[in-house]
């Protein structure tokens, strides 16, 4: 009876997500059969988040809209470990929008989810950011410095990375 009500709850939760994500990949977390964490298929998972590399080329605003339609945001990178995970799935000859922008062109960078911008946990390429006109951030590969961030014009289409919290059922 307990298992039955738990299953019903899970199914109704899954139905919530079905609109955007017809298929979820779930893994059992820990030893407890009741704790499952899921990411939409074919998103990848790292710690408590799911990630999707969008290969469609769009402006920053459209890229963020595209993520939000899927219940996500453009990626907010909080640690070096998280960036190291993300770059495993990126192509070296491409650039990808991050959820980081400077809306007023004042060098006041902000994350889309309002996570405080911490200068000590940023991975800008050397000499970046460097232009008041370039109000959006991308991650790209430079042979001299590997992967890092660069500021660019927000209206120039790029690929992007979406991030959402894992779905717990």
């Amino acid at each position: 009876n307990f298992m039955y009500s738990k299953t019903v709850k899970r199914l109704s939760k899954l139905r919530e997500y079905q609109q955007y994500h017809p298929s979820l990949t779930c893994v059992m977390e820990g030893k407890d059969i009741e704790d499952w964490s899921c990411c939409p298929t074919p998103w990848t998972s790292f710690q408590s988040s799911c990630y999707f590399i969008s290969t469609g080329m769009q402006s920053w605003t459209k890229s963020q809209k595209n993520c939000s339609v899927m219940g996500a945001d453009l990626v907010v990178i909080n640690t070096r470990e998280e960036q190291d995970f993300i770059i495993q799935n990126l192509k070296r000859n491409s650039s990808y929008f991050l959820g980081l922008s400077d809306p007023g062109g004042r060098r006041h960078w902000q994350w889309v989810d309002q996570t405080p911008y911490n200068e000590n946990v940023t991975f800008w390429h050397s000499g970046e950011p460097n232009n008041l006109d370039e109000r959006c951030a991308i991650i790209n590969f430079r042979s001299s410095e590997e992967w890092g961030w660069n500021d660019i014009h927000c209206h120039v289409p790029q690929k992007s990375i979406c991030k959402m919290k894992k779905i717990y059922i």
Partner: antibody, heavy 118, light 107 residues
């Protein structure tokens, strides 16, 4: 080649307003913000502010807030700066300058002399 | 606001000399230091940006160096056409600010 052509010298009365222009050519106008810089006679350069030619928003030096209004006309690739409630302290050469990488002003107009005199 | 100080307001040198103009910021400006040349007719040109990078078309006799709060512009082989006033400018923090200028004259 990049060129910034400013409007001609102006003589204006105290309390009046003046609007000077800066027409950009030889590049994509909306890709580069426009800065304005003041130089009073025999004095150093003073940064007034910058306007985004793409978004139309401005960042002003606090010292010039209320004195200066910057605008842009994308269709004619022209930036404007209006100075209001003029006093003798506003007598100066005003330069427009294009925004560049590494927080720099990479190309400058020839300057517009504004003389405030009764 | 960040204060920019050019301690020498005027400098006299001979043609062919090596001339160094200095600029000090009131706080670390992370190499966002630019140098401009203003000719006697009022024309302003960018010479050097980001401490040491030469702007397009600028002769290689101009060079820049420095870090933190202390920066300098060097003209290695002074030419008649270098007679001008030189300004440093920091772009690290808004509002951008300029030094007082150094006027270069020929002996």
């Amino acid at each position: 080649q990049v060129q910034l052509q400013q409007s001609g010298a102006e003589v204006v009365k105290p309390g009046a307003s003046v609007k000077i222009s800066c027409k950009g050519s030889g590049y994509t106008f909306t890709d580069y913000s426009m800065h304005w810089v003041k130089q009073a006679h025999a004095k150093s350069l003073e940064w007034i502010g910058v306007i985004s030619t793409y978004y139309g928003d401005s960042n002003y030096n606090q010292k010039f807030k209320g004195k200066v209004t910057m605008t842009v006309d994308k269709s004619s690739s022209t930036a404007y700066m209006e100075l209001s409630r003029l006093t003798s302290d506003d007598t100066a050469v005003y330069y427009c300058a294009r925004n560049g990488n590494f927080y720099v002003m990479d190309y400058w107009g020839q300057g517009t002399l504004v003389t405030v005199s009764s | 606001d960040i204060q920019m100080t050019q301690s020498t307001s005027s400098l006299s040198a001979s043609l062919g000399d090596r001339v160094t103009i200095t600029c000090q910021a009131s706080q670390d400006i992370s190499n966002y230091l630019n140098w401009y040349q203003q000719k006697p007719d009022g024309t302003v040109k960018l010479l050097i940006y980001y401490t040491s990078r030469l702007h397009t078309g600028v002769p290689s006799r101009f060079s820049g160096s420095g870090s933190g709060t202390d920066y300098s512009l060097t003209i290695s082989n002074l030419d008649q056409e270098d007679i001008a006033t030189y300004y440093c400018q920091q772009g690290n923090t808004l509002p951008w600010t300029f030094g007082g200028g150094t006027k270069l004259e020929i002996k």
